[in-house]
């Protein structure tokens, strides 16, 4: 019987900004029942507080509602596991909630074939940002990326958008039914999972691009 | 106790390329964005470009674009610097640093001296 | 780029003495979500540099108090209360609002 190992805070998620939820991953259990608390202050503060909510982000987390989260603070955590023998912590770690931003996937995914007489066919793709993430404030900028493949192929083709929300892609196989996916980074943060898919059928007179 | 443990001095011939790495060890490498920075003799820091290991993602400064690529191995946890067409200019020591959840630079490698000489 | 011009360039100062670092930016480092990222480093002789203030004002983990930082938009100062002999190298200030990052010239602090 020991005391517990050292525990690593090793994940912090928000979606949007306004809260987040750090995990850490516990060390060794020493071979007794072991209790975890994490205990954290705010830049300029010398006052400890406790995790708020230990129950919304799951086993081994702590997760900050809306009036514990404050963009404009960088939070210094730390994780202490206790059992009957003693007590070990974690390394305190740095949280500035702008960089552990990962957005929702996007939203609205449609997909078009278009065929203008005068130029090569494309195809064209088009989506909106996620809901919950506010673009006006102007300090978050996402960046997109789109994956597409013939239903039945086993690799994905992957373009980067961007900032921008559509995108034309021209070298595609006619006659094949396509799946398109979408998903969204904010540029020092996270990307977000992919899209649900969206299925296009490509046309048997569909040009290949030279 | 975080560590991050660089490749050794190199030598090299303009027009070149090297490759310096950084290993990570004392915490979940995918966990943090790593930088890399560089000072060339009696100078000031510039900074290179930075990786996320969780998924190879990368930012470079525009003056290196081109030359260098940053890239990672998560089965080593180790970061790597390429940089090419070598120039007198670039010869530098140049380090690997790790943020935590943020954008600023915690914890540095010991550094790796690259000369550029013909 | 962001450019970060440190003054003096050098500074001898006697053991128990303060000392006062400045450094300007060439734009306003106060980033869009309201936080300014300008932070001060201390490379100690034949070390790799060490993280002091973050933030313009917030000590790192571990590092006496008398070192504090100061200012806002493109003005900013690094302050040692009472300088010791271990404090001796080269201070440089860096911004992480605008990428690229960029770094001051840095200051060489020596013990008279």
């Known amino acids: 019987q020991l005391p517990p190992g050292k525990p690593e805070i090793f994940k912090c998620r928000s979606p949007n900004k306004e809260t987040f939820t750090c995990w850490w991953r516990p060390g060794t259990d020493g071979g007794l029942p072991t209790n975890y608390s994490l205990t954290y202050h705010r830049e300029g503060e010398t006052l400890m507080h406790e995790c708020p909510d230990y129950i919304t982000g799951g086993p081994n987390s702590c997760h900050f509602g809306k009036q514990y989260t404050s963009m404009w603070r960088t939070y210094i955590m730390m994780v202490n596991a206790t059992n009957q023998m003693g007590s070990s912590f974690s390394d305190e770690l740095y949280v500035d909630v702008t960089y552990i931003v990962q957005p929702d996937p996007p939203l609205e995914l449609a997909v078009e074939v278009k065929q203008p007489e005068d130029r090569k066919p494309y195809l064209w793709i088009k989506w909106s940002p996620p809901t919950l993430i506010d673009l006006k404030t102007g300090w978050f900028t996402l960046l997109y990326e789109i994956r597409l493949k013939p239903e039945k192929a086993a690799e994905w083709e992957i373009h980067f958008a961007g900032q921008q929300t559509e995108f034309k892609i021209l070298s595609l196989h006619p006659g094949q039914k396509y799946l398109v996916q979408v998903r969204c980074k904010p540029d020092h943060g996270y990307w977000s999972a992919w899209s649900p898919a969206t299925f296009i059928q490509i046309p048997s007179d569909f040009t290949m691009n030279d | 106790e975080v560590q991050l443990v660089q490749s050794g001095a190199e030598v090299k011939k303009p027009g070149s390329s090297v490759k310096v790495s950084c290993k990570a060890s004392g915490y979940t490498f995918t966990s943090y964005w790593i930088h890399w920075v560089r000072q060339a003799p009696g100078q000031g820091l510039e900074w290179i470009g930075e990786?996320?290991?969780?998924?190879?993602?990368?930012n470079y400064n525009q003056k290196f674009k081109g030359r260098v690529t940053i890239t990672v191995d998560k089965s080593t946890s180790t970061a790597y610097m390429e940089l090419s067409s070598l120039r007198s200019e670039d010869t530098a020591v140049y380090y690997c640093a790790r943020s935590f959840f943020t954008n600023w630079f915690a914890y540095w490698g010991q550094g790796t001296l690259v000369t550029v000489s013909s | 780029d962001v450019v970060m011009t440190q003054t003096p360039l050098s500074l001898s100062v006697t053991p128990g003495q303060p000392a006062s670092i400045s450094c300007r930016s060439s734009q306003s480092l106060v980033h869009s979500n309201g936080n300014t990222y300008l932070h001060w480093y201390l490379q100690k002789p034949g070390q790799s540099p060490q993280l002091l203030i973050y933030k313009v004002s917030n000590r790192f983990s571990g590092v006496p108090d008398r070192f504090s930082g100061s200012g806002s938009g493109t003005d900013f100062t690094l302050k040692i209360s009472r300088v010791e002999a271990e404090d001796v190298g080269v201070y440089f200030c860096s911004q992480s609002t605008h990428v690229p990052f960029t770094f001051g010239g840095g200051t060489k602090v020596e013990i008279k």
């Open positions: 990786i996320d290991p969780s998924d190879s993602y990368t």
